[in-house]
Interface confidence: medium
């Protein structure tokens, strides 16, 4: 590397590189100072004078050491489906990310260009794959023995309760209704248990039925409802 005593501008040795925070000006054929982040080159160097740097104006920035004649413009204000996670300053661009309940359908180098609402699985369908910052929710029909009675982007299919005496059999979109007093939760075959995402919905609870006068003979009805007629997963 050139001797550290050289002051900019200076001519590098043929084929050599300039020092850190210096660049080779091809017009002057000299090593000249770069401008620091938050600045830009107001006057380029010559053989006898170094780069003159100036601060970026409002709503413009430079994030890197540079020798650009003008600072870069900050991106436009975040849209209503976005939140500003990094403000526009002289040293960094504004970054917009999607607000909760939305995902990034079209990303850019930093942040998101286009947000879209997370798909909601309708009753009879549960979340097979939760949404992430950059991917939509994937829904699946509730398997026999499971149900979802909500329109939600977070709820999975849950097992029907097992009744001593069944009043109404469950289906894909409704839990079983019991006539006995002490229903027990089934771990029904085919139920897929995903880690429950943080959700604001209230837990589904079955109202406590009246005490039954029926004999206490236990029996189970077949729990498998016929698959939903509609094949789509809904919005």
């Amino acid at each position: 590397l050139p001797a550290q005593v050289a002051f900019t501008p200076y001519a590098p040795e043929p084929g050599s590189t300039c020092r850190l925070r210096e660049y080779y000006d091809q017009t002057a054929q000299m090593c000249c100072s770069k401008c620091s982040p938050g600045q830009h080159a107001k006057v380029f160097c010559t053989k006898t004078s170094d780069t003159v740097c100036d601060s970026c104006e409002d709503s413009t920035y430079t994030q890197l050491w540079n020798w650009v004649p003008e600072c870069l413009s900050c991106g436009s204000r975040c849209s209503s489906d976005q939140v500003e996670t990094q403000a526009c300053t002289r040293e960094q661009n504004r970054i917009c990310t999607c607000r909760p309940g939305w995902y990034c359908a079209l990303s850019k180098q930093e942040g998101c260009r286009l947000c879209a609402p997370l798909r909601k699985c309708r009753p009879g369908f549960g979340v097979a794959r939760p949404g992430t910052e950059t991917s939509d929710v994937v829904c699946k029909p509730c398997a026999p023995g499971t149900f979802s009675n909500t329109t939600s982007s977070t709820d999975i299919c849950r097992p029907h309760q097992i009744c001593n005496v069944v009043a109404i059999p469950g289906n894909a979109s409704m839990d079983a209704v019991c006539t006995s007093t002490s229903p027990t939760r089934s771990m029904a075959p085919g139920a897929v248990h995903l880690p429950q995402p943080v959700s604001t919905r209230s837990q589904h609870t079955q109202p406590t039925p009246e005490p039954s006068t029926a004999p206490s003979t236990s029996f189970l009805l077949p729990m498998g409802p016929s698959p939903p007629a509609e094949g789509s997963t809904g919005d």
Epitope: G15, T17, Y23, Q26, T62, N66
Partner: nanobody
């Protein structure tokens, strides 16, 4: 804008060797200068080695004879071969490139090199 990604860092014993790679997401043939600098906690960043587009290397006195910088424009990759490592070589190593079409110094996220017994 081209992205630079370093790899090859890690823990090595004194006297050992490591090879750092810097892969660019686009062509590096127009980058007049590329190089490596390092920064240890609480220290200024220090230019370790640089190489011009014509392939001429330059080294800091502290690494001369131990480190070798090379670049392959066809593979869009920069390398730093580090031999006879010393504890004082411990730092985060960054690759950089002077992008003349943009007027910016690009740099990677860094690779941690720890030299310790």
């Amino acid at each position: 804008q081209v992205q630079l990604v370093e790899s090859g860092g890690g823990l090595v014993q004194p006297g050992g060797s490591l090879r750092l790679s810097c892969a660019a997401s686009g062509s590096i043939s127009d980058f007049y200068a590329m190089g490596w600098y390092r920064q240890a906690p609480g220290n200024q960043r220090e230019l370790v080695a640089a190489i011009s587009s014509s392939g001429k290397p330059n080294y800091a006195d502290s690494v001369k004879g131990r480190f070798t910088i090379s670049r392959d424009n066809a593979k869009n990759t920069l390398w730093l071969q580090m031999n006879s490592l010393k504890p004082e070589d411990t730092a985060v190593y960054y690759c950089y490139a002077d992008d003349y079409s943009a007027g910016f110094e690009l740099r990677g996220q860094g690779a941690l090199v720890t030299v310790s017994s």
